[in-house]
Interface confidence: medium
């Protein structure tokens, strides 16, 4: 396995793709199939990715670089490197424990992933609401009231809301 | 000198669990894929689990898939099963061989699932 | 799963004389590199397997060399040219190239007449 490393180590000539075969005087041996060194000097050649199941390969395993993964259609990828593959929804719901659920109401989702945002409040920015939000699109927040006086604008003033950023769904 | 020593075995009740541990000395534990693979008395040695050198890949075998999960903790230079609703026929020496090809083996610990 | 098959499961055999061990498995092992991935193991009464010959013919360190291996694709052969008493134990094939998972043959038992 490992020996004191000298200035004349056999090991450090072994390149990525191989490794220094303790069993054979420490010659270069190439790595195994289904593993991969990506630096010269190794030991041993590690385990490669397996991409099985929900998971789909991107990129094969080489001898010097480690397989790649993503999802196959209708999951996508979460965490570094996609280490797990989390399955779509439709675009105005959220994935929940008991599956996709549609966005309650005040709330939208414009993607297949991710969880339901509320709408945005436009009275927060003294606007008003010019296109309805629904459970896939947020709401447009026009200009305010004070905005749409006589030649101000040539929009349409929105037919006034009961409560900025609601709609019926 | 490579040394591998397994350890946590003993004797458990079926649907209990059970952590076995493996330290690791004398070559460079972070470099090296590890794994479990044990024998049942009387009986040869069946692969359990395998698991990358820095920890990101897992791999079982389907009698223990979703049972057992396999880690590693390389600052420690220690390897870890941890065993769920264990049966009887998990009942069995557990080794932690190193490497990709198994070069080196631990003594094992014995592992007794049992009512 | 590649299955490993090993004749004969029991060997009793005589000390000085040769032996022969056979294992074959049901998908080829030679990859296109030219190597066969199949790995040898013996296991010696109340020890734990220790690695003897990889990649189908080549010795792990420290193994004497009355043992070898041979074969090629499925077919596979261990032989010790003079068994000692020391050799006795259950000798194991198992397969290293579709790995994981990896598979071992049933496991051999060789014993002294």
């Known amino acids: 396995f490992e020996r004191t490393r000298s200035l004349q180590d056999p090991c450090s000539n072994c390149p990525a793709g191989t490794f220094c075969d303790n069993n054979r005087n420490q010659i270069c041996s190439p790595c195994p199939p289904n593993s991969f060194s990506s630096a010269g000097g190794q030991r041993t050649c590690d385990i490669c990715r397996q991409c099985k199941g929900v998971f789909r390969t991107r990129k094969e395993c080489s001898s010097t670089s480690n397989a790649e993964c993503d999802c196959t259609p209708g999951f996508h990828c979460l965490g570094a490197g996609c280490s797990m593959c989390e399955q779509d929804c439709k675009q105005g719901q959220e994935l929940t424990k008991k599956g996709c659920k549609d966005c309650c109401f005040g709330t939208f989702n414009d993607q297949k992933r991710g969880i339901c945002r509320p709408w945005t409040n436009c009275s927060l920015d003294g606007k008003s609401v010019l296109v309805n939000g629904t459970k896939e699109r947020d709401v447009v927040c026009g200009p305010s009231p004070a905005d749409l006086s006589p030649g101000a604008s040539s929009v349409t003033p929105p037919a006034p809301a009961r409560e900025p950023g609601h709609s019926p769904q | 000198e490579v040394q591998l020593v397994e350890s946590g075995g003993g004797l458990v009740k079926p649907g209990e669990s059970l952590r076995l541990s493996c330290a690791a000395s004398g070559f460079t534990f972070k470099s090296y894929p590890m794994a479990w693979v044990r024998q049942a008395p009387g009986k040869g040695l069946e692969w359990v689990s395998s698991i990358s050198s820095s920890g990101d890949h897992r791999y079982y075998a389907d009698s223990v898939k979703g049972r057992f999960t396999i880690s590693r903790d390389n600052a420690r230079n220690s390897l870890s099963l941890q065993m769920n609703n264990l049966r009887a026929e998990d009942t069995a020496v557990y080794y932690c061989?190193?490497?990709?090809?198994?070069?080196?083996w631990g003594r094992g610990t014995l592992v007794t699932v049992s009512s | 799963d590649i299955v490993m098959t090993q004749t004969p499961l029991s060997l009793p055999v005589t000390p000085g004389e040769p032996a022969s061990i056979s294992c074959r498995s049901s998908?080829?092992?030679?990859?296109?590199?030219?190597?066969?991935?199949l790995d040898w193991y013996l296991q010696k009464p109340g020890q734990s397997p220790q690695l003897l010959i990889y990649w189908g013919s080549n010795r792990a360190s420290g193994v004497p060399d009355r043992f070898s291996g041979s074969g090629s694709g499925t077919d596979f052969t261990l032989k010790i040219s003079r068994v000692e008493a020391e050799d006795v134990g259950i000798y194991y094939c198992m397969q290293a190239l579709h790995v994981p998972p990896y598979t071992f043959g049933q496991g051999t038992k060789v014993e002294i007449k």
């Open positions: 998908q080829s092992l030679l990859y296109s590199n030219g190597y066969n991935y």
């Open positions: 061989p190193a490497g990709r090809d198994f070069d080196h």
